[in-house]
């Protein structure tokens, strides 16, 4: 239920801004206004703190994994949950916090030398002649090296903006993080009212292109604060 989500660790550990990895403050994206939670068929806003929707583990921060917030919950509603610490129960590597991995259903500390070998074996097996789905830790590890050998084109899945071709940034688009065009002059952008709020939106816009900044549209000065329209304008 929504209450159990709000009381869970997911809220204490909000994901990093999309477009930058955890701990990287420079986000390349601009969130559309209205922070929304996909619950049932309605989007609910709750005190500006929202679970972060996801489809796969690699869409979450480095210290999170993607799962349904309720036990045996609806597969249609998955959010980024805080990773499991050492000795906590797990079902796959991605559930365990960095420096740990899932062994016999428990998060255990990874002996670096040993564990690195295990991951490489998994990757080699999975990427033999077919393109099998990689689960958990191994899939995350491979994304940057295998999937992004060429820069992502518009609409392709990405983890960060450096995965995308020139003129594109990595931003959330409901089902995933994809490469989107950097905004041009006159295009609608989003001005973030408070630091950190842009990591929570289902749809994100890129930043304004070079020589442009996100400013309130001149003919919108009279509008109420909440509905003011911002566009990319020349400095």
């Amino acid at each position: 239920t929504l209450n159990s989500v709000l009381n869970s660790n997911a809220i204490k550990n909000l994901p990093p801004p999309l477009g930058g990895a955890a701990g990287h403050p420079g986000s390349a994206v601009s969130a559309a206004p209205g922070i929304l939670y996909p619950g049932g068929n309605k989007y609910q806003t709750i005190d500006n703190y929202q679970p972060y929707p996801c489809a796969e583990d690699e869409e979450c921060g480095t210290d999170e994994y993607c799962a349904s917030p309720t036990r045996g919950g609806d597969a249609g509603v998955q959010i980024c949950l805080a990773c499991r610490k050492r000795r906590k129960r797990c079902m796959r590597h991605a559930m365990c916090c960095p420096g740990n991995y899932c062994k016999n259903g428990i998060c255990v500390s990874s002996d670096q030398n040993n564990f690195r070998g295990e991951i490489e074996e998994t990757i080699t097996e999975s990427f033999g002649n077919d393109h099998s789905t990689l689960d958990g830790y191994s899939r995350r590890t491979t994304l940057s090296s295998k999937m992004y050998h060429s820069k992502g084109q518009e609409g392709s899945v990405c983890l960060r903006s450096s995965d995308c071709a020139t003129g594109l940034c990595c931003a959330r688009h409901f089902w995933s993080k994809i490469c989107k065009p950097v905004l041009k002059e006159g295009q609608v952008c989003t001005k973030h009212r408070r630091k950190g709020s842009h990591g929570l939106e289902i749809f994100q816009r890129c930043y304004c292109g070079e020589g442009l900044s996100c400013r309130i549209q001149k003919d919108h000065h009279q509008a109420s604060n909440s509905s003011r329209l911002h566009t990319c304008q020349r400095h």
Epitope: A32, A55, T133, M147, G155, S156, V157, F174, V188
Partner: antibody, heavy 116, light 111 residues
Framework: QVQLVESGGGLVQPGGSLRLSCAAS????????MSWVRQAPGKGLEWVSG????????HYADSVKGRFTISRDNSKNTLYLQMNSLRAEDTAVYYC?????????WGQGTLVTVSS | DIALTQPASVSGSPGQSITISCTGT?????????VSWYQQHPGKAPKLMIH???NRPSGVSNRFSGSKSGNTASLTISGLQAEDEADYYC??????????FGGGTKLTVLG
């Protein structure tokens, strides 16, 4: 250039099954989510199903849940829709579409007719 | 369930401007601030014309523009041409259904 070509449509009796295929070319298939959208004769568009780039995440419209299965083979650049327990109301042109920024490329569609 | 309402038909003469509206509830068009528009010629596949309310994909004529006010999104076509005659669909999002389409609007170019 991006190309999506559907096949596998045809006439089938109510309760029957059909498997649609969509051959993709001109882009890195494994980097995109994909969808099936249908359009009944003279009617509007209805989203049917979507699948993540790796195939590990699938979503369905309520009207087809439990009857249709979406899948993909990234080594063959092909998207599939297995349709079971077909009903008269499933009669439509079925389009496969790339989920880039929204449904940015569509195939020409394949007609599925469910009739006795 | 989310529903998007579009007028069944709109018409205009060549050179004119026309606007097609798409009205939804606050949980979709109004809440999301994200609407897309598709054009579909008879017997053809739909084509994405506008995304994020007002952004045109490359290759789409700048005669097509999108806007949104409250719970209503609008597609405006200026300098109407014969080849604009088609069906137009708006689309937004539902948490479980992903893509939700409006009923479609048939645009007729007169003369």
């Amino acid at each position: 250039q991006v190309q999506l070509v559907e096949s596998g449509g045809g006439l089938v009796q109510p309760g029957g099954s059909l498997r649609l295929s969509c051959a993709a070319s001109g882009f890195t298939f494994s980097s995109y989510w994909m969808s099936w959208v249908r359009q009944a004769p003279g009617k509007g568009l209805e989203w049917v199903s979507g699948i993540s780039y790796s195939g590990s995440n699938t979503h369905y419209a309520d009207s087809v849940k439990g009857r249709f299965t979406i899948s993909r083979d990234n080594s063959k650049n092909t998207l599939y829709l297995q349709m079971n327990s077909l009903r008269a109301e499933d009669t439509a042109v079925y389009y496969c579409a790339r989920m880039g920024i929204d449904l940015d490329y569509w195939g020409q569609g394949t007609l599925v007719t469910v009739s006795s | 369930d989310i529903a998007l309402t579009q007028p069944a038909s709109v018409s205009g003469s060549p050179g004119q401007s026309i606007t097609i509206s798409c009205t939804g509830t606050s949980s979709d068009v109004g809440g999301f601030n994200y609407v897309s528009w598709y054009q579909q010629h008879p017997g053809k596949a739909p084509k994405l014309m506008i995304h994020d309310g007002s952004n045109r994909p490359s290759g789409v004529s700048n005669r097509f523009s999108g806007s949104k006010s409250g719970n209503t999104a609008s597609l405006t076509i200026s300098g109407l041409q014969a080849e604009d005659e088609a069906d137009y669909y708006c689309q937004t999002w539902d948490s479980l259904s992903f893509f939700v389409f409006g009923g479609g609007t048939k645009l007729t170019v007169l003369g």
